[in-house]
């Protein structure tokens, strides 16, 4: 979808944490991601490409992230029951034009059993 | 209110050049990525170019690139397209129009110019 | 490249008739499709953007839908304005049109 939810799995957890799945077409070549908790921006990451296809990431809000060739994924640790929120995924497309912005999103749940550092 | 208009067509020789215009007016030209289309007769709609709202990136459509030149001059709220090495299968009818908002990004083209006539003939 | 294809190349109409175009794409597009209206020696005109929103001051009676691959515009009951030639066109990747639908009067 251009605006509208998930349609896959957006939140991974794992170690009392979560990973959170943006994905983007394979087409894409130059982008910018950015992770918006609510309307507040936690992170994000721009991929561009310059003479002779040298690639350049660069993020100006840092988070663990990893990029593959058809997703961003973020990463927030020691969950607590504050991370609970809507999480979306904002895409700049900036190559192949023309110029497009998507944004999808979801609600971040947080159970007990996913929370960081539990007593045992 | 919002408008595009063309000028610059005209006929001229396969191998001459010319150089449209395309004036702006009713809106924020620099906010804007803009494009040239154009239409040969009885033909559908070709994209020839594009460029972004700061004119740092410009794409072209395979058959004019290295021919054509688009440029802006946001103070002059002003797109440009120089034609060079023109060619018979050029002919047509040029638009501008406008693109992506640099915020928004596309939504379609949603104002064009009432375009301008391009004739390459000996 | 991605190549737009619709049908009917021509289409003949009568006013309050209910007319359906399509456009096919030669892959995925996902909804980065718009329509646009042209009329003879006139600049084509925005209707429809990202393949279902109608563009402001377009009458309601035109209408988008599809995605993927599939695309349909529809104009609910036509009108004598609307006799015109309809042009599918994606921006999922650069810009190509179909080949135009022309809606006669019948």
């Known amino acids: 979808e251009i605006n509208g939810s998930a349609n896959y799995e957006m939140f991974i957890f794992h170690n009392g944490g979560v990973q959170i799945l943006c994905k983007y077409p394979d087409i894409v070549q130059q982008f910018k991601m950015q992770l918006l908790k609510g309307g507040q921006i936690l992170c994000d990451l721009t991929k561009t490409k310059g003479s002779g296809n040298t690639v350049s990431i660069k993020s100006l809000k840092f988070c663990h992230s990893q990029l593959s060739n058809n997703s961003v994924s973020f990463f927030l640790y020691n969950l607590d029951h504050s991370h609970a929120n809507y999480y979306f995924c904002n895409l700049s497309i900036f190559d192949p034009p023309p110029f497009k912005v998507t944004l999808t999103g979801g609600y971040l749940h947080i159970y007990e059993s996913q929370l960081c550092c539990q007593l045992k | 209110q919002v408008q595009l208009l063309e000028s610059g067509g005209g006929l001229v020789k396969p191998g001459g050049s010319l150089r449209l215009s395309c004036a702006a007016s009713?809106?924020?030209?620099?906010?804007?990525?803009m494009n040239w289309i154009r239409q040969a007769p009885g033909k559908r709609l070709e994209w020839v170019s594009y460029?972004?709202?700061?004119?740092?990136?410009?794409y072209y459509v395979d058959s004019v690139r290295g021919r054509f030149t688009v440029s802006r001059d946001n103070a002059k709220n002003s797109l440009y397209l120089q034609m060079n090495s023109l060619r018979a299968e050029d002919t047509a009818v040029y638009y501008c129009?406008?693109?992506?908002?640099?915020?928004?990004?596309?939504?379609?083209?949603?104002?064009w110019g009432q375009g301008t006539t391009v004739t390459v003939s000996s | 490249d991605i190549q737009m294809t619709q049908s009917p190349s021509t289409l003949s109409a009568s006013v309050g008739d209910r007319v359906t175009i399509t456009c096919r794409a030669s892959q995925s597009i996902s909804s980065w499709l718009a329509w646009y209206q042209q009329k003879p020696g006139k600049a084509p005109k925005l209707l429809i953007y990202?393949?279902?929103s109608l563009e402001g001051g377009v009458p309601s009676r035109f209408s988008g839908s599809g995605s993927g691959t599939e695309f349909t515009l529809t104009i609910s009951s036509l009108q004598p304005d609307d006799f015109a030639t309809y042009y599918c066109?994606?921006?999922?990747?650069?810009?190509?049109f179909g080949q135009g639908t022309k809606v006669e009067i019948k």
């Open positions: 460029i972004s709202n700061s004119g740092t990136t410009i």
């Open positions: 990202k393949a279902s």
């Open positions: 009713g809106f924020t030209f620099s906010d804007y990525y």
């Open positions: 129009a406008r693109d992506a908002h640099y915020v928004s990004g596309s939504e379609g083209m949603d104002v």
């Open positions: 066109q994606q921006y999922y990747s650069y810009w190509t």
